[in-house]
Interface confidence: low
């Protein structure tokens, strides 16, 4: 089976603008690509299956997304711990200042995104 986790965090050194509401814009696509790449770096273990439903909200930039793992390979605490451990690396590698990290279980992957 598959376990899903809903993750939300702030990128405090980026500014939200209307182009982050439109997936066709360069800014949206670049930020989406860089965040996807970052998560592949963070969760390198075999259980990570990928992420989906990236959304951007105002508040500098608030990022919301769903992470998928093989069932039983990771729990909420470990998802949050690994992400928090990566924050300084995110600053250096991706020029992202991350704060206000929140992780929760998602019983059905996309219900939390509606």
């Amino acid at each position: 089976g598959v376990s899903f986790f809903f993750l939300s965090f702030h990128i405090s050194n980026l500014q939200f603008n209307s182009s982050l509401e439109d997936p066709s814009t360069d800014y949206y696509q670049e930020l989406q690509r860089d965040i996807s790449e970052m998560f592949l770096q963070i969760y390198k273990q075999g259980g990570f299956l990928g992420l989906s439903n990236i959304k951007f909200r105002p508040g500098s930039v608030v990022v919301q997304l769903t992470l998928a793992f093989r069932e039983g390979t990771i729990n909420v605490h470990d998802v949050e711990t690994q992400f928090n451990q990566y924050k300084t690396e995110a600053a250096s590698r991706y020029n992202l200042t991350i704060s206000d990290v929140s992780v929760s279980d998602v019983p059905f992957p996309f219900s939390a995104q509606s």
């Epitope: 980026l14 930020l31 451990q85 300084t88 690396e89 600053a91 250096s92 991706y94 020029n95």
Partner: antibody
Framework: EVQLVQSGAEVKKPGASVKVSCKAS????????IEWVRQAPGQGLEWMGE????????NYNEKFKGRVTFTADTSTNTVYMELSSLRSEDTAVYYC????????????????WGQGTTVTVSS | DIVMTQSPATLSLSPGERATLSCRAS??????????IHWYQQKPGQAPKLLIY???NLETGIPARFSGSGSRTDFTLTISSLEPEDVAVYYC?????????FGGGTKVEIK
Amino acid sequence: EVQLVQSGAEVKKPGASVKVSCKASGYRFIPYWIEWVRQAPGQGLEWMGEILPGTGRTNYNEKFKGRVTFTADTSTNTVYMELSSLRSEDTAVYYCARYGDDTSGGYYAVDYWGQGTTVTVSS
Amino acid sequence: DIVMTQSPATLSLSPGERATLSCRASESVNILGTNLIHWYQQKPGQAPKLLIYHASNLETGIPARFSGSGSRTDFTLTISSLEPEDVAVYYCLQSRKIPWTFGGGTKVEIK
């Protein structure tokens, strides 16, 4: 003062392994990546890979994957690069370098380098 | 892999002249507005020395005659007035994608 001090020159036979050390001082060792770069005689610079000492996370250049291993000893602030199955083309100067930030923490680059370790592979 | 191409291979100038070194990436090295390109100077028998980071930021202690410019794929290192001690090989490095890659280098000589 940030310093990276590498071990001395090595002469090895083809097929052997070599282990080069890089001792760091003058900064917080754990949160900074250490890069490994080599330079063959008269040639340019080639990135081999990196290790983050605090977690042991590594990234390798695919060209060297399977032949190179990076390890870190946080008790002595030392990083090691071991290259196996040596061939004559591995004759080079091997550098370790810190991927560090400026005083404001705003920018990152490979800023401090070791003095280099010459590895000669010859039968 | 991102291929970094430097030109010219050799630059021979008189003291006081302006040196312009080029580095071209095979794909963009920009990430969220930051260009992950760095310039190094290497003199014979020495380790490389960081001159410019993130395309245009002068490393502490480096003379102001060195400057960097460019974005995404095309970058330039400029030495505004060449000094004899600037004789060296200059390398660009991209840290945007693993494996990190260096350009082949530009050798700067004094005429």
